[in-house]
Interface confidence: low
């Protein structure tokens, strides 16, 4: 079955259908008579029970809370409750980019080596029965592909294949037309024994935090075996007892390259942790690449343009 929504923090684009599926679904079927409730809270607002009367955009089906569509004011915390089982999600609804066919903050980056097998298949299992047609766009220009239900690209990668690929599913619900967009930033890299290491994701990340809480900054890179990934912060690393570098995780690819991930954990965030650079660097004989994180107090979020924000 469609996997339940296990991620506790979710970012979604306004105007698209969206659903939350709780993770005790099989259990809920067995206990049909058990009271099952969905709640929302946002800001100072207390838990408000959700039902189809709450909004014409909300639908409840078995294990799922559906939004038709999700809008900016749906941002908040959502709870599912059944007997002594509770599941919580934090939903952040972001503005759609009206000047593009996709929203930059909702792009999945993938790296494909030149001459290696390259494939994009447009599928959306949850809404499959409602989808009328699906289109695949490259850099917001529609690609003419035979199959308009599940358009697919299968080929050996060339440098010309680099770009933004958007799968757009068009579907009807209660007489209205909706679309769901999934976009991939495909980067084609040289097929060679040593790659130029690259950090994944934006170069500058503003992270909204609350004082006294904890945050985990994740730094991921594609690199060679002998390359190193490290964090730099403050005048002297290790001076803050609340900052901890977690153990580096590495997974090898068949080509002998590595995907590495290193987390910087900041506990009990204080004023001294705000508005300073936490730099993650990947270094190799071929050069270095650095990305930066800046912690910003949640109350100050409004001062920063939305496009530079990250979760």
């Amino acid at each position: 079955a469609e996997s339940c929504t296990s991620r506790p923090h979710i970012t979604v684009v306004e105007g698209e259908p969206f659903y939350l599926k709780h993770c005790s679904c099989s259990l809920a079927h067995e206990i049909e008579t058990t009271t099952k409730s969905w709640y929302k809270s946002s800001g100072s607002q207390e838990h408000v029970e959700l039902n189809p009367r709450s909004s014409s955009r909300i639908a409840l089906h078995d294990c799922v809370l559906e939004f038709w569509p999700v809008e900016l004011n749906d941002t908040g915390s959502y709870f599912f409750q059944m007997k002594n089982y509770t599941q919580k999600w934090k939903l952040n609804v972001i503005r759609r980019n009206k000047h593009s066919c996709f929203t930059e903050r909702q792009v999945t980056s993938k790296i494909v080596e030149v001459k290696k097998f390259f494939q994009i298949t447009c599928e959306n299992s949850y809404y499959q029965t409602l989808v009328n047609s699906t289109s695949l766009y490259k850099n917001c220009k529609k690609l003419l592909l035979e199959n308009n239900k599940n358009p697919t690209i299968k080929k050996n990668a060339e440098f010309e294949d680099q770009g933004y690929y958007s799968c757009v599913h068009f579907l009807h619900h209660n007489g209205k037309l909706f679309n769901i967009t999934k976009t991939f930033n495909i980067t084609i890299v040289e097929d060679r024994s040593n790659i130029v290491p690259v950090l994944l994701g934006p170069k500058l990340n503003h992270v909204a935090v609350e004082l006294g809480k904890n945050v985990r900054l994740n730094c991921s890179a594609l690199l060679n075996e002998e390359d190193v990934i490290y964090w730099m912060f403050g005048e002297e690393n290790g001076s803050d007892p609340n900052i901890h570098e977690e153990k580096e995780m590495r997974i090898m690819t068949p080509e002998g390259k590595w995907h590495a991930s290193k987390v910087l954990r900041i506990e009990n965030i204080g004023e001294s942790n705000l508005n300073v650079l936490y730099n993650c660097t990947v270094a190799s004989t071929g050069g270095t690449d650095t990305k930066s994180f800046i912690l910003v107090r949640k109350a100050d979020m409004a001062d920063i343009p939305g496009h530079v924000f990250t979760r």
Partner: nanobody, 126 residues
Framework: EVQLVESGGGLVQPGGSLRLSCAAS????????ISWFRQAPGQEREVVSC????????IYADSVKGRFTISSDNAKNTVYLQMNSLKPEDTAVYYC???????????????????WGQGTQVTVSS
């Protein structure tokens, strides 16, 4: 409807072998990345191995390299995990997962899967 059904788990002595199967349906099998994850009690879920049936990419976590082998049978839409030289620390619930937006090459098993199976218990004990 997408389905991932695992089988083959059980109790085995240290040094023994098991073969896990993951039968997939409801999506384009050769356009996906199929991963095996595991979760031991009180531990975080970790990726063990991944295969892309479309391009033959395979990856392994360091802890299982040389002991585990992942393979796929495209005709049966099934992925196998052959586990040899099992150790007590391999004890966990093993989950099959699918990333149906896989696009080839280096990212097998690294993105959050779209779908998960129910899991099968593997216990290594004397």
């Amino acid at each position: 409807e997408v389905q991932l059904v695992e089988s083959g788990g059980g109790l085995v002595q240290p040094g023994g072998s098991l073969r896990l199967s993951c039968a997939a349906s409801g999506f384009t099998f050769d356009g996906a990345a199929i991963s095996w994850f595991r979760q031991a009690p009180g531990q975080e879920r970790e990726v063990v191995s991944c295969v892309s049936p479309g391009d033959g990419t395979t990856i392994y976590a360091d802890s299982v390299k040389g002991r585990f082998t992942i393979s796929s049978d495209n005709a049966k839409n099934t992925v196998y995990l052959q586990m040899n030289s099992l150790k007590p620390e391999d004890t966990a619930v093993y989950y099959c997962a699918a990333d149906t937006y896989y696009s080839g090459g280096a990212h097998c098993g690294l993105l959050s899967p779209d779908y998960w199976g129910q899991g099968t218990q593997v216990t290594v004990s004397s």
